[in-house]
């Protein structure tokens, strides 16, 4: 796959994933009422990160925001934080990657700068995706724990069902937002990885032809292909290092610009 295609696809995949992370964060259905005991309930409860809702069979839906910070479970606060971190990093990643796209020319930005920006955006997308996946997973774990705790209460806390009155405890199970979040986080992560892969190919190469170096005598010596080998754009300059038969490379050798005689 060409560098431009890899970079472009990575950007699009990350963008879709990022949109999914925002959607999941805003969705109300992080946890939904478990209908195992009563599949035809006239009242259906579901909860999000920001509010809880009740949908009546009549079609009326009432939602109430969590108008408190201190009264909320620490885990819920942590999940909120992780999702927001994912969104913020995603926004920065998108802004950086727009400037890094090979198909977009901005001023006299060289390929080296684009490579660095591509890698940066890739890393941001990876962290954004991981942050969302961790957030969703923490919430899912919290749900599973609460589900089994309330199940235990249902079967132990009824006084052996001796009384006539049953107290039905509402249990919650995975809502649609969890699946959206997992998929979105995964897409953002994959997109980020693709951006990082594209970065390797973006490291400036003056040509994709095979480079050949010459001694002053004109004797042809060993050569190695140029192109995409481990070019990250960070650290030392990796521009088609020349290999000489003898003698140490000078600083000039490493930094020298090719002449029209450098290539066959």
């Amino acid at each position: 796959m060409s560098v431009t295609a890899c970079q472009g696809l990575g950007f699009v995949v990350s963008l879709i994933g990022f949109a999914g992370i925002i959607a999941a964060t805003c969705m109300d259905q992080w946890s939904t009422q478990d209908l195992y005991n009563n599949p035809v309930t006239a009242v259906f409860n579901y909860q999000g990160l920001w509010r809880s809702c009740v949908r009546e069979s009549s079609g009326f839906t009432e939602c109430r925001g969590y108008f408190t910070l201190l009264g909320l479970p620490a885990m819920l606060q942590a999940v909120r934080a992780l999702m927001i971190v994912g969104i913020v990093l995603g926004v920065i990643g998108i802004l950086v990657s727009i400037f890094a796209l090979k198909c977009i020319r901005i001023g006299s930005m060289d390929d080296s700068a684009k490579a660095k920006m591509t890698l940066t955006s890739g890393i941001l997308f990876i962290i954004s995706g991981i942050s969302a996946i961790i957030g969703v997973s923490v919430f899912a774990n919290m749900l599973v724990t609460n589900f089994w705790m309330s199940t235990a209460n249902m079967y132990s806390g009824m006084g052996g069902m001796g009384g006539m009155v049953q107290t039905v405890q509402t249990r919650y199970t995975f809502g649609a937002a969890l699946f959206v979040g997992w998929v979105a986080g995964g897409l953002t992560l994959i997109g980020g990885v693709m951006m990082c892969i594209a970065c390797r190919g973006l490291t400036p190469d003056d040509s994709n032809f095979k480079a050949v170096s010459y001694h002053a005598s004109g004797q042809n010596v060993a050569y190695r292909p140029g192109g995409f080998k481990a070019s990250t754009g960070f650290g030392s300059n990796t521009r088609n290092k020349k290999i000489y038969d003898g003698g140490a490379r000078t600083e000039d050798d490493e930094q020298s610009h090719p002449t029209k005689y450098d290539y066959v």
């Epitope: 009422q33 309930t41 006239a42 409860n45 909860q47 009549s58």
Partner: antibody, heavy 118, light 113 residues
């Protein structure tokens, strides 16, 4: 003014069929779920069936499941109850009722009487 | 299915008297999501369809006189008429609005002495 008018009741032999209708006016019919509730002579109220605003959700009482079919035509603001395999215990006044916030029947029709007798 | 037990089955009172009738549920009608109790009260006069009085156990429907008051926990509910009038003579039904099948109590018949 909200109005629900039932029609189609009458005398039917056991095992027979009949279709009840409920014409609605005075509110946006397509926005509300509607129920059928019946009342046997000198008895209490018994819920029969429910259909949601867009017909996506339908529930029946166990006593009528498989024999009765609830449907609606939002274009004509009309609710239907198709009854088959009728029994003497189905004899009752059949009301259609509008379902509203709080899961309550805020408006009822005047009812139509079904008598199942040989 | 949720069973609603109404008591007494009939009640004979004099005008101006305070009346209370009970409705007990076999299952809690309290929804944890919004802390609302899904019990509804209806009044049915002879030869008429039922009329909505109270929903969510204590919310009076528009146009219902304030002498009618609903209260109760998740399983035990009470309808109170603070001062009975002649036009209040009817059968009063409670209804489970929490889960299907929707169920009604057998009714409490209010009669004048």
């Amino acid at each position: 003014e909200v109005q629900l008018v039932e029609s189609g009741g009458g005398l039917v032999k056991p095992g027979g069929s009949l279709k009840l209708s409920c014409a609605a006016s005075g509110f946006t019919f397509s926005d509300y779920g509607i129920h059928w509730v019946r009342q046997a002579p000198e008895k209490g109220l018994e819920w029969v069936a429910y259909i949601s605003s867009g017909s996506s959700t339908i529930y029946y009482a166990d006593t009528v499941k498989g024999r009765f079919t609830i449907s609606r035509d939002n274009a004509k603001n009309t609710l239907f109850l198709q009854m088959t395999s009728l029994r003497s215990e189905d004899t009752a006044i059949y009301y259609c009722a509008k379902w509203d916030r709080g899961n309550c029947f805020d408006y009822w029709g005047q009812g139509t009487t079904l008598t199942v007798s040989s | 299915d949720i069973v609603l037990t109404q008591s007494p089955s009939s009640l004979t009172v004099t005008a101006g008297e305070k009346v209370t009738m009970s409705c007990k549920s076999s299952q809690s009608l309290l929804n944890s999501g919004n802390q609302k109790k899904y019990l509804t009260w209806y009044q049915q006069k002879v030869g008429q369809p039922p009329k909505l009085l109270i929903y969510w156990a204590s919310i009076r429907e528009c146009g219902v006189p304030d002498r009618f008051t609903g209260s109760g926990s998740g399983t035990d509910f009470i309808l109170t008429i603070s001062s009975v009038q002649a036009e209040d003579l009817a059968v009063y039904y409670c209804q489970n609005a929490y889960s299907y099948p929707l169920t009604f109590g057998a009714g409490t018949k209010l009669e004048l002495k």
